[in-house]
């Protein structure tokens, strides 16, 4: 049994970083492999993640992680049975995707404008918080080539748009997404998309 | 309220033993990792001693080792540390601490300290 | 075991003023680097921790920054109840080792 693709790890840096790799043949990851992971740090504990089936030969393990910092080091050794497969070392801060945005909501009853409100995935105290950027993505459900994507570079998890700038009459989805300058982060997944029909009054024409 | 409330401390002659306690309140402190830091006159500060949540593993500084040991009671939440051999040098207050992590960092709890005075 | 090189060892300055101290450490520590203040006769305080991280409830004046072996910590507009010894700290290596605290003075 061998390591065909050394594990890659991300973490959202906040608990959770998941590490996926491929072995060279067919495997049943949780009952033939674990992947063992410690902190740097002394007295740290090690931890034991029992990895799943990702395609045939895939696996993927989800690391459990308290309270991550950019201090943050981790030893990875992957074993199976007694046989050591690899070792390596992950630093959480160097390989970060945040946790997608929730509960984005279109706001239609502002005059002519449309609010679309999000949720910031991160706690107050978590580094992240205050960090993101975010990118919203709305479409036609009528019309491939009508997709527009609007670059939220500001703190506050919202985007307020001129309806008229949307086609009157048909239905729009929206969908939005993270990322973090302060780490070089990977964009976050699209959050669940949400619909609305969108409808505005046409001005009158001056003559 | 957060309190770290150390005793135990005192003269004691060279070659004296001590036993430090610490009495803590207003964490969980069965799941804490904690440690001993001391400051001695014109020194820097030193980690002396940390334990695990679970008293399992310990660590303990060079200056320090087979001399002194720290313990604790999740029981009665309290941490100890007993010090035997004592030296002049050991001469400090020391500082119950609270790790802020599962493993030695930051501390972000600290008593008010106990002197410890080794003199003849 | 890792050199903490505080500096400056003291230093005055006036209410109002930013105030910088630096610490260098003899080997890369990663961000495992650690502020504290200590006031007359009182125990440390966590300040900052993981180079760059404000602890809870700690006033915002209060900053650090830096990674491998160059560490600053910062107070933006120094006010009167400031006046401490702060020391960094280092947890990369082994044993943890402290730098020997800038005594700040208000003039």
């Known amino acids: 049994m061998k390591v065909l693709q050394e594990p890659t790890c991300v973490s959202d840096y906040m608990s959770i970083s998941t590490c996926e790799w491929k072995m060279n043949g067919p495997t049943n990851c949780s009952t033939e492999l674990r992947l063992l992971y410690q902190l740097v740090f002394l007295l740290s504990e090690a931890h034991t993640c029992i990895p799943e089936n990702n395609g045939g030969a895939g696996c993927v393990c989800h690391l459990l992680m308290d309270d991550v910092v950019s201090a943050d080091n981790y030893t990875l050794d992957l074993w199976a049975g007694q046989q050591l497969l690899w070792k390596g070392s992950f630093k959480p801060s160097e390989h970060v995707k945040p946790r997608a945005p929730g509960n984005l909501t279109v706001h239609t009853n502002v005059s002519d404008t449309l609010l679309l409100t999000w949720s910031n995935p991160y706690p107050p105290d978590n580094y992240l918080y205050n960090h993101l950027t975010y990118a919203v993505n709305i479409w036609s459900e009528n019309d491939p080539a009508d997709f527009r994507i609007y670059n939220v570079t500001y703190l506050e998890p919202s985007l307020r748009i001129a309806a008229s700038t949307l086609k009157s009459g048909i239905s729009y989805r929206a969908r939005v997404r993270a990322w973090a300058q302060c780490y070089n982060t990977t964009w976050s997944e699209w959050s669940p998309s949400t619909k609305w029909h969108n409808s505005y009054r046409e001005p009158f024409e001056q003559h | 309220e957060v309190q770290l409330v150390e005793s135990g401390g005192g003269l004691v002659q060279p070659g004296g033993s001590l036993r430090l306690s610490c009495a803590a309140s207003?964490?969980?402190?069965?799941?804490?990792?904690m440690s001993w830091v001391r400051q001695a006159p014109g020194k820097r500060l030193e980690l002396v001693a940390a334990?695990?949540?679970?008293?399992?593993?310990?660590y303990y500084a060079d200056s320090v080792k087979g001399r002194f040991t720290i313990s604790r009671d999740n029981s009665k939440n309290t941490l100890y540390l007993q010090m035997s051999s004592l030296r002049a040098e050991d001469t400090a207050v020391y500082y119950c601490?609270?790790?802020?992590?599962?493993?030695?960092?930051?501390?972000?709890?600290w008593g008010q300290g106990t002197s410890v005075t080794v003199s003849s | 075991d890792i050199q903490m090189t505080q500096s400056p060892s003291s230093l005055s300055a006036s209410v109002g003023d930013r105030v910088t101290i630096t610490c260098q450490a003899s080997?890369?520590?990663?961000?495992?680097v650690v502020w504290y203040q200590q006031k007359p006769g009182k125990s440390p305080k966590l300040l900052i921790y993981?180079?760059?991280y404000l602890y809870t409830g700690v006033p915002s004046r209060f900053s650090g920054s830096g990674s491998g072996t160059d560490f600053t910590f910062t107070i933006s507009s120094l006010q009167p109840e400031d006046i401490a010894t702060y020391y960094c700290?280092?947890?990369?290596?082994?044993?943890?080792?402290f730098g020997g605290g800038t005594k700040l003075e208000i003039k």
């Open positions: 993981s180079a760059s």
């Open positions: 207003g964490f969980t402190f069965s799941s804490s990792y």
């Open positions: 601490t609270r790790q802020r992590g599962n493993y030695v960092g930051a501390m972000d709890y």
């Open positions: 334990i695990n949540s679970n008293g399992g593993k310990t």
């Open positions: 700290h280092q947890y990369y290596g082994s044993p943890p080792t």
């Open positions: 080997q890369d520590v990663s961000t495992a």
